[in-house]
Interface confidence: low
């Protein structure tokens, strides 16, 4: 007798394989999220019909920062448990005891490398076919670090500044919220900020910008602040002087013009009066006080501290001339002055802005308020300057002597030796 | 500085057990493993087990399995190893060494305990 | 699992270089990024050179380095000194229940 195949075989093939156990493993919740440092619970839990003999459970990670290389978590196979990748060591474990339907993993002191997709693959032969794959993913937060406050710009008034926050830590990524701590906790009206940047542009500051303000960086699990401390400059003292400076300029320059044209009118009268004389030298003057000691060395301008600090630049060998004459008044304004005898007057450049120069070959530091004056020697016997050792020793001269300031094309065709004049103004700070 | 000093060489017979010690120092001792490592004479380095100072959770070599106990006293930052039933095939050098817990390299070790097993 | 393969000896002149190969499994040294490397001299504790494949602990010379290609992991040395004269060990992790494999260790030999 031949065996037949019955046509119901397949059927029959089917029950029986319904009756041996499916093993299914339950859905996951997809993600969990916890910040760094605590505990994660990754759930995992199937259901079978047969004895747990034969469990066999292989937790795999593939990290979020190296997804080429998955790692092996816990693993539980003949009923024994085997720690995973060293990096898990003594942090990770069954949160139940094993062999149990409920395979969930605890890790402790979670770390940000730990951020990735979790896997747990469940075998428990005689079971076959079902999903025995669970999948969940593990994002470790980070609150924010303190965050740095800077300013960036200049604070003076006007001037357009950004405040800048930011936290080198924080997962997800921080977003920053500038404030002013003042009554309203607003920031100016001319202010514009970027929450995801951490800026903060305040446009034309002004006083009312001045004040404390706050950076908040905060994401899902934390907040962090720093502070900033804005204070707008008002215009400097400095900045005042360059202005009147300049008003003072222009006085300056018309002052200047009366006084070449009483310099003229006072040269041309006694040029007139005395044309038999026979000329005599002129000498370059300052009307400064002899220093203690001058020696006469390489060229080379000091800048001494009598009353106006006259300069006056010779050629190479620092020859020094001083005025006697008691009808040069030593005055620091910006101002001309004429003496009582009408003869004889002084003038201070007050706030010309000259550099610093150079004399024959010599860099020369601009000096406070140099004044430079050319004596005509109107006496038959002038002054005689004798250097000797290296000092300039000084003689009687006559006394009748007149002081003039004199235009530069009258010095030029007179034949003194030309010198730039540096300013200070009275401070002694550069103009 | 790390340091892991271990206790002086022992003269055993077979059967015995023997308990070696390492003391830690210059280290947050819970932050890392102790793994014992051991060298028989004219041998290469053969892995013994792993105890983690954080939790005690241990892990020991598949051929040691149930003669070794790693035992630690965070106390003391002293981590113990005993190893019973001994045989004159355990005759080794027992070093202990530090286990960073996040890459798996040994990286300080003790100066190492002669034992020596004989009748 | 057996231990990883290394060669017994290797040897070189002072000035040269050496590499020093180590042969797993994708189960060991081609599965992890965690091969490191020890040098031991005779009488003394071994002393960790390379760590997780390529990384340098401080205080060893750069003369020391490492690298992986699929199963087979290396350590290089150049510039030979006469005190690199020593049996050089690698390890890696491999999964459980084993965890660690040491090689059989390579004795070096500077001529």
């Known amino acids: 007798m031949t065996s037949q195949r019955s046509p119901l075989a397949p059927l029959l093939l089917l029950s029986l394989h319904g009756v041996a156990a499916s093993l299914e493993v339950s859905e996951s919740p997809g993600s969990i999220q916890v910040a760094r440092g605590q505990p994660a619970v990754l759930p995992c839990t199937f259901t079978t019909s047969a004895a747990l003999i034969n469990l066999n459970v292989i937790w795999m990670v593939t990290p979020l920062s190296n997804a080429n290389q998955p790692e092996q978590v816990i693993l539980y196979q003949g009923g024994q448990m085997f720690d995973g990748a060293p990096r898990f060591h003594g942090r990770v474990g069954f949160t139940g005891t094993m062999p149990a339907t409920n395979v969930s993993i605890f890790i402790n002191n979670t770390q940000l490398s730990d951020t990735g997709t979790y896997q747990c693959l469940v075998n428990n032969l005689p079971d076959i076919g079902g999903r025995n794959i669970g999948v969940t993913g593990l994002t470790v937060l980070v609150p924010p670090s303190a965050p740095h406050c800077q300013i960036q710009g200049s604070q003076d008034i006007g001037s357009d500044v950004i405040l800048l926050c930011s936290s080198e830590e924080g997962i997800p990524r921080p977003t920053y919220l500038w404030e002013k701590l003042d009554n309203t906790l607003k920031l100016p009206p001319t202010a514009t900020q970027d929450q995801v940047q951490g800026t903060v542009t305040i446009r034309n500051i002004s006083a009312l910008s001045s004040g404390l303000y706050q950076c908040v960086a905060s994401n899902a699990i934390g907040t962090s602040t720093c502070l900033l401390d804005l204070q707008v400059i008002s215009p400097q003292p400095r900045n005042i002087g360059l202005i009147a400076g300049a008003i003072g300029t222009g006085a300056v320059i018309i002052i200047f013009c009366i006084a070449l044209i009483l310099g003229a009118f006072f040269y041309w009268r006694s040029k007139n009066k005395e044309e038999e004389e026979e000329e005599i030298p002129n000498e370059i003057r300052e009307d400064d006080l002899p220093p203690k000691c001058s020696s006469a060395k390489a060229f080379h301008t000091e800048i001494s501290s009598s009353d106006n600090n006259t300069l006056t630049s010779s050629n190479a060998y620092n020859s020094r001339y001083w005025s006697n004459n008691p009808k040069v008044h030593r005055n620091t304004e910006s101002v001309s002055h004429f003496s009582d005898l009408g003869q004889s007057f002084s003038f201070h450049s007050g706030n010309a802005n000259i550099p610093s120069i150079y004399a024959n070959g010599t860099h020369l530091v601009p000096g406070q308020h140099k004044t430079l004056v050319v004596t005509a020697n109107r006496g038959s016997s002038p002054q005689v300057m004798s250097r000797s050792n290296g000092s300039v020793s000084r003689k009687p001269r006559p006394p009748h002597t007149h002081s003039y300031t004199i235009s530069h094309a009258t010095l030029e065709r007179i034949g003194a030796v030309p010198v730039m004049v540096p300013a200070q103004s009275r401070a002694g700070s550069l103009v | 500085q790390v340091q892991l000093v271990q206790s002086g060489a022992e003269v055993k017979k077979p059967g015995a057990s023997v308990k070696v010690s390492c003391k830690a120092s210059g280290y947050t001792f819970t932050s890392y493993g102790i793994s014992w490592v051991r060298q028989a004479p004219g041998q290469g380095l053969e892995w013994m087990g792993w105890i983690s100072a954080y939790n005690g959770n241990t892990n020991y070599a598949q051929k040691l399995q149930g003669r070794v106990t790693m035992t630690t006293d965070t106390s003391t930052s002293t981590a113990y190893m005993e190893l019973r039933s001994l045989r004159s095939d355990d005759t080794a050098v027992y070093y202990c060494a530090r286990v960073p817990a996040w890459s798996g390299q040994f990286d300080y070790w003790g100066q190492g305990t002669l034992v020596t097993v004989s009748s | 699992q057996s231990a990883l393969t290394q060669p017994a000896s290797v040897s070189g002149s002072p000035g040269q270089s050496i590499t020093i190969s180590c042969t797993g499994t994708?189960?060991?040294?081609?599965?992890?990024?965690?091969v490191s490397w020890y040098q031991q001299h005779p009488g003394k504790a071994p002393k960790l050179m390379i760590y997780e494949v390529t990384n340098r602990p401080s205080g060893v010379s750069d003369r020391f380095s490492g690298s992986k290609s699929a199963n087979t992991a290396s350590l290089t040395i150049s510039e030979l000194q006469a005190e690199d004269e020593a049996v050089y060990y690698c390890?890696?992790?491999?999964?459980?229940?084993?965890?660690?494999?040491f090689g059989g260790g390579t004795q070096l030999t500077v001529l």
């Open positions: 390890n890696s992790y491999t999964s459980g229940p084993t965890y660690v494999l």
């Open positions: 994708s189960s060991d040294v081609g599965g992890y990024n965690y």
